[in-house]
């Protein structure tokens, strides 16, 4: 595929990535799938500058990111290393809380109303952010 050189309509460019901010809510898996269908992924926060950028755009609203521990260890959806990477958890989080009564623990990460992160039940219908890198090859066939 051809290399994407500018962001799609209604996406916002920042530091060679493109971001799309939802205004409705979905479960984490549905949000993840939505981004994949857009040839993108749920946002992967790799730096303090990226954290601040996303936070400015989403405001004080619970919003999914591309971080989960559904298979054990915490993993970013694009393979970015979690252990050595940027983290911005709220105090005492993640806590894999079981007391919500919805079955299981909390396996998906989201931005809270103050921007710091929390783990929550993946079925909750939160807003989400998709991200795609400008320098990666797009899956669309080149125009002839």
């Amino acid at each position: 595929g051809s290399e994407r050189t500018c962001c799609p309509v209604n996406w916002v460019e920042h530091e060679r990535s493109c971001y799309w901010f939802s205004r409705s809510g979905k479960a984490w898996a549905d949000a993840d799938n939505y981004c994949r269908l857009e040839d993108a992924h749920l946002v992967v926060v790799t730096s303090w500058e990226e954290q601040k950028f996303v936070q400015r755009h989403i405001g004080p609203v619970n919003t999914w990111m591309g971080l989960h521990d559904q298979n054990g260890p915490w993993k970013w959806v694009d393979g970015t290393d979690y252990e050595t990477g940027f983290k911005n958890w709220r105090p005492e989080q993640p806590d894999d809380w079981y007391g919500h009564g919805l079955g299981g623990g909390e396996d998906c990460a989201h931005f809270t109303d103050d921007g710091r992160w929390n783990d929550d039940v993946c079925q909750r219908p939160y807003r989400w952010v998709c991200e795609t890198e400008l320098d990666k090859a797009s899956q669309e066939p080149p125009l002839l």
Epitope: T46, S47, W48, E49, K52, P60, T84, G85, F86, K87, N88, D113, D114, G115, R116
Partner: antibody, heavy 117, light 107 residues
């Protein structure tokens, strides 16, 4: 112009607490995170944490967790850093610094905290 | 935590000299690095942010370069007011960390 003006020098005994203030002017106080950085005599710089004056969220360096509290009063555009259970090795100059792009773009003049019995 | 190292730890130079200070991060920080100048008894002053962007009001003889793990601060022609200690700092992830400093003094 942006200015960060800190409170005056303090002398404390081991085990006591100190609260340093940092009054901001020349910009929208709630629009930028405020960091605290300390420097022991003749030593390098050590980041302590930040507060978001807009929503009161904080993030403290693990080394200071449980001993430090950062607060703010938006009505007077002032950030505060309280450090408890002081030890002699907490003797340092404490600076507030405004969050910039991958940097601290403006710094307070510093507050010397001396811990001595 | 990300460790920051600087070299040299001190350098003796003369007015007009070109001075280069290097900073290395223990893991990749992309371009999220700042450089500060500090004089005795004063607060640090921001010179360079995002590895190569010159802070407003800072003379153009200061420049920064690098990305990933290796970074450089260059003073193209040292002036009398440049004798100071210089620190690099990573602002990629918490805890933010500083290099140990490089003292530039008069030869």
């Amino acid at each position: 112009q942006v200015q960060l003006v800190q409170s005056g020098a303090e002398v404390k005994k081991p085990g006591a607490s100190v609260k340093v203030s940092c009054q901001a002017s020349g910009y929208t106080f709630t629009g930028y995170h405020m960091h605290w950085v300390r420097q022991a005599p003749g030593q390098g710089l050590e980041w302590m944490g930040w507060i978001n004056p807009n929503n009161n969220a904080t993030n403290y360096a693990q080394k200071f967790q449980g001993r430090v509290t950062m607060t703010r009063d938006t009505s007077i555009s002032t950030a505060y850093m309280e450090l408890r259970r002081l030890r002699s090795d907490d003797t340092a100059v404490y600076h507030c610094a405004r969050d910039g792009t991958s940097s601290f773009d403006y710094w307070g003049q510093g507050t010397l905290v001396t811990v001595s019995s | 935590d990300i460790q920051m190292t600087q070299s040299p730890s001190s350098v003796s130079a003369s007015v007009g000299d070109r001075v280069t200070i290097t900073c290395r991060a223990s893991q990749g920080i992309r371009k999220w690095l700042a450089w500060y100048q500090q004089k005795p008894g004063k607060a640090p002053k921001l010179l360079i942010y995002a590895a190569s962007s010159l802070q407003s009001g800072v003379p153009s003889r200061f420049s920064g370069s690098g990305s990933g793990t290796d970074f450089t601060l260059t003073i193209s022609s040292l002036q009398p007011e440049d004798f100071a200690t210089y620190y690099c700092q990573q602002a990629n992830s918490f805890p933010f960390t500083f290099g140990p400093g490089t003292k530039v003094d008069i030869k």
